[in-house]
């Protein structure tokens, strides 16, 4: 017994003066706590506590299930304990078969012994199958077998306590061994979609998928800069041991526009944390926005090809798409598609494909556009460059030689002289009249220049030449005259086109 | 065959009270701590409350402590769950299992967990 010097509290004195006692089942149990201020005896084995306020504990019978720890303790807090054994053959092992270990810590196989004397005192593989290699486990008779460091790979290990009793291998009742892993990874957290585009009233429904090796792991879904609680919903699944997978929904029944925003599915373990956004971006109706992908004002050459190309975006998804000219629609030749196949994708490219086109063909082409709640449009203007080409050329009866020219951009008419026989015309001759006509045609059509010098100025034989040009090409009329006497011959007009 | 078989669940008022009983056969009842565990419906499994293989030591979770009473009976393997003060929040079903695991996880579940007793709490 405890001895301590005078004045001080002492522990109580226990009789039986022994920390072990050994009874055999049946025997009496009779403990006697001896202290001025006792106040109670207590009992513990496995998860099992009793009081007993008497200070002396007697049991008559003594059971197996009465094998613990007694404890007397007085009014100091002082205490004293006797460990007693009650031997019983045909009940070797108190248990719990309770058995949860968590990964890389030990955990206690509790199936404490009645006898101590018993050898061998150790784990076995249930139906004979050997333990994991790496398992150790240290015995204690008082408290059963624990075992260290457990591993994930123990995991619903179906096992024994075992001791020799008589030369015979007695087995306890099974244990099956459950481990919770420890977190040595950030979950995995992803979400059903990384946008969302709403109209006002429609329900805002998003999923945030968790991966983790266990349920433990937390998630929330956080609205960026905001406290405030959001309500979601719940599932989960164990794919198997160690893959757990947790989808917490969010949902707004019906967005508003202040709804819009940043919403952030948190999960975190003792390892680390790891997060996933989503944007929401709520409008009051819907829109579509159109991009030219050239110029609106487009200048192609006669017989040349020309696509005219918008991106457009539209929410929700567009209805109906035409191309118009000159208040026809398109049937063929043009096509609409999605820019992207992903599945929020509001953005689509249309194509007009114009082939040859002729310099009657210039002009107004519209794309029109229209969802649900809005209409688009979009014109492009296009003219065709088409290469001078000379109307009229005359002599009339006042004398002026007058040249007509049609093309566009609009021609400019130049005027020489070539005296004689002279193929070179290099002389050149100021007209005296140029008019811009204004053409009967649909507009972006050719445009018409007039213009008139006077003949009464050649003195010589000669040919005069109007050369009609712009950025396209030039054509070129020539005038041939000739004098006899002092009377000028009839003008033979005749023209040379210059490629 | 091991048979978990709970029973005594039904519909009462907030603030009412239940008894809710489980009888244990084909396993060693006395081998084991025992647990009540509960799933509202759309939620994961909630351990409810837990005793020791002897009765001596019993363990509850916060949200029901001071209103629920577990306590068993190894002479009849039957395991019991005093529910006083209730309210709509405890709406589950209702299970017994085998096991307790202190840290309240459950990895893995249980040796043996039984179908369940529905108690609805409602006004």
């Known amino acids: 017994q405890p001895s301590v010097s005078p004045g001080e509290p002492s522990p109580p004195s226990i009789h039986p003066g022994k920390s072990d006692l050994i009874v055999r089942v049946g025997d009496e149990i009779r403990l006697l706590c001896t202290d001025p201020g006792f106040v109670k005896w207590t009992f513990e084995i496995l998860d099992e506590t009793n009081e007993n306020k008497q200070n002396e504990w007697i049991t008559e019978k003594a059971e197996a299930t009465n094998t613990g720890k007694y404890t007397c303790t007085n009014k100091h807090g002082l205490s004293n304990s006797i460990y007693v054994f009650v031997r019983d053959p045909a009940k070797l092992f108190l248990v719990d078969r309770s058995l949860y270990g968590k990964e890389d810590n030990d955990t206690l196989v509790r199936c404490p012994l009645t006898d101590p004397e018993v050898t061998n005192y150790s784990l076995k593989g249930c139906q004979g199958k050997p333990l994991p290699k790496d398992l150790r486990f240290i015995p204690d008779p008082k408290a059963g077998i624990m075992i260290k460091s457990v591993k994930r790979a123990y995991h619903r290990l179906c096992l024994h306590c075992s001791v020799d009793q008589e030369g015979k291998s007695v087995l306890s009742e099974k244990f099956i061994l459950k481990v919770r892993p420890a977190f040595k990874a950030v979950p995995v957290v992803s979400v059903s979609k990384a946008s969302y585009l709403l109209r006002e009233g429609e329900e805002f429904t998003v999923t945030c998928t968790i991966k983790d090796v266990s349920s433990s792991v937390y998630s929330t879904w956080k609205r960026e800069n905001s406290q405030t609680k959001l309500q979601e919903k719940y599932n989960s699944w164990h794919h198997g041991d160690f893959n757990y997978e947790r989808q917490a929904t969010l949902t707004i029944s019906s967005a508003r526009v202040n709804d819009s925003g940043v919403f952030m599915c948190y999960a975190n373990n003792t390892f680390g944390s790891a997060n996933v956004t989503t944007t929401l971006e709520v409008v009051d109706k819907g829109f579509i926005n159109i991009f030219p992908m050239i110029n609106t004002t487009v200048f192609v050459n006669d017989g040349e090809n020309v696509d005219l190309i918008v991106e457009y975006e539209a929410f929700p998804k567009p209805e109906h798409q035409q191309w118009i000219y000159m208040n026809r629609t398109f049937t063929d030749k043009w096509e609409d598609y999605p820019k992207s196949e992903n599945e929020s994708n509001i953005r689509y490219v249309s194509e007009l494909h114009l082939t040859r086109l002729k310099g009657t063909e210039g002009g107004t082409y519209t794309f029109l556009v229209s969802n649900s709640d809005v209409n688009a449009a979009i014109a492009f203007n296009v003219y065709v460059n088409t290469k001078p080409e000379i109307l009229t050329y005359d002599r009339l009866v006042n004398g002026m030689l007058q040249c007509v020219a049609a093309g566009f951009p609009e021609p400019t008419i130049d005027w020489y002289f070539c005296p004689g026989t002279e193929q070179r015309c290099s002389a050149s001759v100021l007209p005296v009249d140029v008019q811009t006509l204004n053409s009967s045609g649909p507009p972006f059509g050719k445009l018409v220049v007039q213009s008139s010098i006077d003949s009464s100025a050649f003195k010589h034989n000669g040919t005069v030449e109007c050369k009609a040009y712009n950025d396209v090409g030039k054509t070129s009329a020539y005038f041939n005259f000739a004098f006899k006497g002092n009377n000028k011959e009839q003008i033979h007009p005749h023209t040379l086109f210059t490629p | 065959e091991v048979q978990l078989l709970e029973s005594g669940g039904g519909l009462v008022q907030p603030g009412g009270s239940l008894r809710l009983s489980c009888a244990a056969s084909?396993?060693?009842?006395?081998?084991?701590?025992m647990s009540w565990v509960r799933q509202a419906p759309g939620e994961g499994l909630e351990w409810v409350s837990a005793i020791s293989t002897g009765g001596g030591s019993t363990y509850y979770a916060d949200s029901v402590k001071g209103r629920f009473t577990i306590s068993r009976d190894n002479s009849k393997n039957m395991l019991f769950l005093q529910m006083n003060s209730l309210r709509a929040e405890d709406t589950a079903v209702y299970s017994c299992a085998t096991g307790y695991d202190s840290s309240g996880y459950y990895y893995g579940g249980f040796d043996y967990r039984g179908q369940g007793t529905l108690v609805t709490v409602s006004s």
């Open positions: 084909g396993f060693t009842f006395d081998s084991y701590a």
